[in-house]
C-alpha cells in the first residue's frame, strides 16, 4: 500500500490521543534506552510503511502484536485516514481471524514495540530541529 495520500495530520492526532498511550502501557516497566534503534524511516509515508510492517507482520520471535490494542487502533486509524487502505487489508484480516490465547509478552515483542514507538516519534514531529 502507498501511504502518500493519507491524511497525516489526522493520523498524528489519533496517535497522540490513543495509540501512543497503548504503546506506552505495553512497554510499562521498560526504559526506551533498553533497546537500540534498529529501524528508521525517512518521511511520513515511509514511516507508515514501516509501522504497518512492524505492527502487522508476524516475526518468528514475536508473532502476536497484531492482536494488541495499539495494533487494532493503528489499523482503524489507517483505514479511516488512508484512502483505499482497508480494501488492501481484507485478506490479511481473514488470515488473522483464528485467535489464540494471548501469550506472555516476550522481550523480543518489547523490543519490537520499542522500535514502533521510535517510528511513531519520527512520524509525528518535524524530526530535525533545524535545516
Amino acid at each position: 500500500y502507498d501511504f502518500t495520500n493519507c491524511d497525516f495530520q489526522k493520523i498524528e492526532a489519533d496517535y497522540l490521543r490513543t495509540i501512543s498511550k497503548d504503546l506506552i502501557t505495553y512497554m510499562s516497566g521498560t526504559k526506551s534506552t533498553d533497546f537500540n534503534n534498529t529501524v528508521s524511516c525517512s518521511n511520513r509515508p515511509h514511516c507508515l510503511t514501516e509501522i504497518q510492517s512492524l505492527t502487522f507482520n508476524p516475526t518468528p520471535r514475536c508473532a502476536s502484536l497484531a492482536k494488541e490494542m495499539f495494533a487494532r487502533k493503528t489499523k482503524a486509524t489507517l483505514a479511516l485516514w488512508c484512502p483505499g487502505y482497508s480494501e488492501t487489508q481484507i485478506n490479511a484480516t481473514q488470515a488473522m481471524k483464528k485467535r489464540r490465547k494471548r501469550k506472555v509478552t516476550t522481550n523480543k515483542c518489547l523490543e519490537q514495540v520499542s522500535q514502533l514507538l521510535g517510528l511513531w516519534r519520527r512520524f509525528i514531529r518535524t524530526l530535525l530541529k533545524k535545516q
Epitope: 537500540n36 534503534n37 534498529t38 529501524v39 528508521s40 524511516c41 525517512s42 518521511n43 515511509h46 514501516e50 519520527r122 524530526l127 530535525l128 530541529k129 533545524k130 535545516q131
Partner: antibody, heavy 122, light 108 residues
C-alpha cells in the same frame, strides 16, 4: 547486535580499480542512509559518499566524484563502493557507517564498521 | 563548500572540564554531531543534534551550539577520554557531509 563489517581492501596500483563491501546485520538495513568515510594515515576523517535508504539517490565528495560509485543491495543488506582510477591520495582506511535520514537531510552516523585499509602504490 | 574549524589540540587535567570548539559560518543553524576516535579504532558517536547523547555515552559528555561556534564539553576528565574528537554537519545546500579537522584531547 548491530554490526557493519567492511571488506575488499588491499594494495592496488595507481589507475586500477577496487571494490569495497560492507555487510550490515542486526538492524533493518533498508531503512537507513549509508555512508563511506575514509581516513588517510595520520589524518582526519574525510566523508566520501552517501546513498539514500532506498538506493535511489547518491551524493559524493568532490575529491571522488566521477571515480567512485556507491551502491547498495537492500535484499542482501550490503553496501558497496566501486573505486576506479585510484590515486595515491586515496590511500586510507575506509569506514562504512549508517545514518537515519529525514527527507533529504542525513542525521548523525550512529553505527560504524571497523574499517578496511586501501593502499594505492606502485 | 562549508568549512568547520577545530583547534588541533586541547589539554585537560584529570577531574577538570575540557571544552572543544567547532567553528563554522552560522553553525547555530545546523545540527552538529560529535565523534570520539581512539587510536586504531573506528569513530564513536558521543553527541548528536547539538546536545543529545546516545544512551551508551556517559552524562559527562554534553554539547551546545549557537552563533558561529558549537562546543563539546567533557566534565570530570578521565584518562580514558584521551582521543581525537571530530565535529560534523550535513551541508544541505551542497548535499555533503562536512567534518572538522579534529581535536586531539590530552588528559595531563
Amino acid at each position: 547486535q548491530m554490526q557493519l563489517v567492511e571488506s575488499g581492501g588491499g594494495v592496488v596500483q595507481p589507475g586500477r580499480s577496487l571494490r569495497l563491501s560492507c555487510a550490515a546485520s542486526g538492524f533493518t538495513f533498508r531503512t537507513y542512509g549509508m555512508h563511506w568515510v575514509r581516513q588517510a594515515p595520520g589524518k582526519g576523517l574525510e566523508w566520501v559518499a552517501v546513498i539514500w535508504y532506498s538506493g535511489t539517490t547518491t551524493h559524493y565528495a568532490d575529491s571522488v566524484k566521477g571515480r567512485f560509485t556507491i551502491t547498495r543491495d537492500n535484499s542482501k543488506n550490503t553496501l558497496n563502493l566501486q573505486m576506479n582510477s585510484l590515486r595515491a591520495e586515496d590511500t586510507a582506511v575506509y569506514y562504512c557507517s549508517r545514518s537515519p535520514q529525514w527527507e533529504d537531510i542525513f542525521e548523525s552516523m550512529d553505527i560504524w564498521g571497523q574499517g578496511t585499509m586501501v593502499t594505492v602504490s606502485s | 563548500s562549508y568549512v568547520l574549524t577545530q583547534p588541533p589540540s586541547v589539554s585537560v587535567a584529570p577531574g577538570q572540564t575540557a571544552r572543544i570548539t567547532c567553528g563554522g559560518n552560522n553553525i547555530g543553524s545546523k545540527n552538529v554531531h560529535w565523534y570520539q576516535q581512539k587510536p586504531g579504532q573506528a569513530p564513536v558517536l558521543v553527541v548528536y543534534d547539538d546536545s543529545d547523547r546516545p544512551s551508551w555515552i556517559p552524562e559527562r559528555f554534553s554539547g551546545s551550539n549557537s552563533g558561529n561556534t558549537a562546543t563539546l564539553t567533557i566534565s570530570r576528565g578521565e584518562a580514558g577520554d584521551e582521543a581525537d574528537y571530530y565535529c560534523q554537519v550535513w551541508d544541505s545546500s551542497d548535499f555533503l557531509v562536512v567534518f572538522g579537522g579534529g581535536t586531539k584531547l590530552t588528559v595531563l
